[in-house]
């Protein structure tokens, strides 16, 4: 069985303040079953950015329909970017369970925010 890969193709993304940022993430396999979550930062303090199954993420939307069968694209779009959104974002695969078990993280995408052009 091929090892699951979580692919974040861009090491960095630069966005002007006020614009939307797309953070790309795909997985190489549908197995094992379990959710993808997005975080900002690493370690115990990492911030939850997007979780499909629950939570309040008013500025974050999935690029593809994550409920669609055989979906392997878990990219997200963050709207109305501000300097406070800068940081490194990680796409993380979990195995379904009680609780879900973290399996693999993408390498991370660093989001930088440029001043809005005048």
């Amino acid at each position: 069985e091929e090892e699951l890969q979580v692919i974040q193709p861009e090491k960095s993304v630069s966005v002007a303040a006020g614009d939307s940022a797309t953070l790309n993430c795909t997985v190489s396999s549908l197995i094992p079953v379990g959710p993808i979550q997005w975080f900002r930062g690493a370690g115990p303090g990492r911030e939850l950015i997007y979780n499909l199954k629950e939570g309040h993420f008013p500025r974050v939307t999935a690029v593809s329909d994550p409920t669609k069968r055989n979906n392997m694209d878990f990219s997200i779009r963050i709207s109305n970017i501000t300097p406070a959104d800068a940081g490194t974002y990680y796409c993380v695969k979990f195995r379904k369970g009680s609780p879900d078990v973290e399996l693999k993280s993408g390498a991370g995408t660093e989001l930088s925010v440029r001043a809005k052009p005048s």
Partner: antibody
């Protein structure tokens, strides 16, 4: 405005238990790790425990096996169950919100725990 | 475990003067060092993280710098509300999250 309000402190005897609560408001509680930090009278700050957004728990060696951190996301509340309390656990216990940088950006006012016979 | 040593333990400064104190890490923490201010009877307040980035709402008179494993917090012109205890904290190696022993800034 972000607010963290601790409760549950008090005077207990060595070996007894206490459960601290921290009610959070003004931010999306489920999206952030939260932590407990304590301060003995006249002393500095000592990190006690942290619970991540996914529920992973971390403890200082001094409390491992005696204290249990938990969170109830539906109530936006953080807890610290303290068993087998010792005199050296006497302190003001603060809860704090953790940023993705692993620093503590908002703190409660604290609740005093006194362990004495 | 990373040990943080703050010096001096107490600093006596007159209002309007510059205050500088340090925090030395027992091993490398990169730039992952934060500073907190605590006034008597109050909770700590985050001032600086990543060695030199001011937290939201912190006045520009507070600045941080790094030289290797030695970190410095400078208050350019002390105001009456700045007399407090200042703690450093490393945020690179966890757990545990470790704090320095504190520097008390008192009125001269």
């Amino acid at each position: 405005d972000v607010q963290l309000v601790e409760s549950g402190g008090g005077l207990v005897r060595p070996g007894e238990s206490l459960r601290l609560s921290c009610a959070a408001s003004g931010f999306t509680f489920t999206n952030y790790a939260v932590t407990w930090v304590r301060q003995a009278p006249g002393e500095g700050l000592e990190w006690v425990s942290l619970i991540s957004v996914t529920g992973t728990t971390y403890y200082a060696d001094s409390v491992k096996g005696r204290f249990t951190i938990s969170r109830d996301n539906s109530k936006s509340t953080l807890y610290l169950q303290m068993n087998g309390l010792r005199a050296e656990d006497t302190a003001v216990y603060y809860c704090a919100k953790v940023t993705w940088k692993n620093v503590f950006d908002y703190w409660g006012l604290g609740t005093l725990v006194t362990v004495s016979s | 475990e990373i040990v943080l040593t703050q010096s001096p333990g107490t600093l006596s400064v007159s209002p309007g003067e510059r205050a500088t104190f340090s925090c030395r890490a027992s091993q490398t923490v990169g730039s992952k060092l934060a500073w907190y201010q605590q006034k008597p009877g109050q909770a700590p307040r985050l001032l600086i993280y990543d060695a030199n980035t001011r937290a939201t709402g912190i006045p520009a008179r507070f600045s941080g710098s790094r030289s290797g494993t030695e970190f410095t917090l400078t208050i350019s012109s002390l105001q009456s509300e700045d007399f407090a205890v200042y703690y450093c904290q490393q945020h690179t190696d966890w757990p545990p999250y470790t704090f320095g022993g504190g520097t008390k800034v008192e009125i001269k």
